[in-house]
């Protein structure tokens, strides 16, 4: 008996960190449900999150197939309990997302300092190489595996007894810095992709300080 009123989704937003990627939208559904489709610029549409009352859809499984591709998603609105029904133009209402290129846009997750080791007046600080959901040859790739030379880390370090910070950079996951003998230092790291224009930097890692159990001290 005619079409049931539905409203189109709006504010379609990509939320992505270390390639874990969720599309969010509004409004909360009232008497309607949603289905999401995703495609690359040259590919076919693939449906996900069928007839859901959620206002988000996890699209990670699709985008990790090729994180350097550019993706477009769209959200269809259907009347609840009558998903065959269509809008006035003879097809369900839908709204397109912005384009999304994971490699260029996914947020860098907060890094973690894996360990630090002091040998005399040098400290080696190692950053955990976080696993992503990107696969190659049936193994999950780490952040370094995916970004390679594009990813650097910045280390902030300071004496526990003062506030003056120093910085160091590395294109690996390790830093080797000079420290003053007999002083305790605190460390924080940040992941950076210098070539980006958006989402260039992660948030800072939790601070780790010497004299706590994460590190190791060896007097040589």
């Amino acid at each position: 008996s005619g079409t049931t009123n539905t409203v189109a989704a709006y504010n379609l937003t990509w939320k992505s960190t270390n390639f874990k990627t969720i599309l969010e939208w509004e409004p909360k559904p009232v008497n309607q449900v949603y289905t999401v489709q995703i495609s690359t610029k040259s590919g076919d549409w693939k449906s996900k999150c069928f007839y859901t009352t959620d206002t988000e859809c996890d699209l990670t499984d699709e985008i990790v197939k090729d994180v350097k591709q550019t993706y477009l998603a769209r959200v269809f609105s259907y009347p609840a309990g009558n998903v065959e029904s269509t809008g006035s133009a003879g097809e369900p209402l839908y709204e397109n997302s912005p384009e999304f290129t994971p490699y260029l846009e996914t947020n860098l997750g907060q890094p973690t300092i894996q360990s630090f080791e002091q040998v005399g007046t040098k400290v080696n600080v190692t950053v955990e190489d976080e696993r992503t959901l990107v696969r190659r040859n049936n193994t999950f790739l780490s952040l370094r595996d995916v970004f390679g030379k594009d990813l650097i880390y910045t280390l902030y370090y300071w004496k526990s007894s003062s506030s003056g910070k120093k910085t160091a950079k590395t294109n690996t996951n390790e830093f080797l810095i000079d420290v003053d003998k007999g002083e305790n230092y605190c460390f924080s790291v940040q992941a950076v992709i210098p070539s980006r224009t958006v989402n260039r930097k992660s948030t800072d890692s939790p601070v780790e300080c010497m004299g706590q159990e994460k590190g190791e001290f060896r007097e040589i």
Epitope: K41, K68, Q69, T70, T101, Y103, L104, R136, G148, K149, N171, T172, P194, S195, R196, T197
Partner: antibody
């Protein structure tokens, strides 16, 4: 399939400038670094620099700073290298290449520049 | 700037295994140098073989493999074919720039 097609041979006068183009097809142009490489007989390959089209970010070999300038147009999937203040030392074959350590480097066919 | 050194020429026979190496003047080559191997055949035909030390590009025959041997990057051709006769260039990444080696002319006869 991935292809990089470069502009044709150029014959230029000393002091002039030239712009070489590199049209990419078959992949997402914005996400891959485009490398520029110089080849002269007896000199092997020289890396000039690179550009990431999606952001416009560039890295240059110190030797070519002031000589080469990279740009990219994502609407036409084309990268460009401009060489300025040409001398006979700039006579060479120039290549663009798409860099990717998993999917392999793809090279253009080369553009021969003669400065005379 | 770092200097990257390759054997200038090597000769092998069909079916033999041959290893080409790539040395850095700054010390041991590591995975952070993302060693790249490219083949040049006549008429300016370049083909990427190996990226990131040991990732073989799609379509490249399995006889080509990349690795680190000692303090150098290496390209090994296991069971060389006559069509592998070419010049092979390695390139190493140093924080913000690539440096090419001088190339190895491989003869297969």
């Amino acid at each position: 399939q991935v292809q990089l097609k470069q502009s044709g041979a150029e014959l230029m006068k000393p002091g002039a400038s030239v712009k070489i183009s590199c049209k990419a097809t078959g992949y997402t142009f914005s996400s891959y670094w485009i490398e520029w490489v110089k080849q002269r007989p007896g000199h092997g390959l020289e890396w000039i620099g690179e550009i990431l089209p999606g952001s416009g970010s560039t890295n240059y070999n110190e030797k070519f700073k002031g000589k080469a300038t990279f740009t990219a147009d994502t609407s036409s999937n084309t990268a460009y290298m401009q060489l300025s203040s040409l001398t006979s030392e700039d006579s060479a074959v120039y290549y663009c290449a798409r860099e990717d350590r998993y999917d392999g480097d793809y090279w253009g066919q080369g553009t021969t520049l003669t400065v005379s | 700037q770092a200097v990257v050194t390759q054997e200038s020429a090597l000769t092998t026979s069909p079916g033999e295994t041959v290893t080409l190496t790539c040395r850095s003047s700054t010390g041991a080559v590591t995975t952070s140098n993302y060693a790249n191997w490219v083949q040049e055949k006549p008429d300016h035909l370049f083909t990427g073989l190996i990226g990131g030390t040991n990732n073989r590009a799609p379509g490249v025959p399995a006889r080509f493999s990349g690795s680190l041997i000692g303090d150098k990057a290496a390209l090994t051709i296991t069971g060389a074919q006559t069509e592998d006769e070419a010049i092979y260039f390695c390139a190493l990444w140093y924080s913000n720039h690539w440096v090419f080696g001088g190339g190895t002319k491989l003869t297969v006869l």
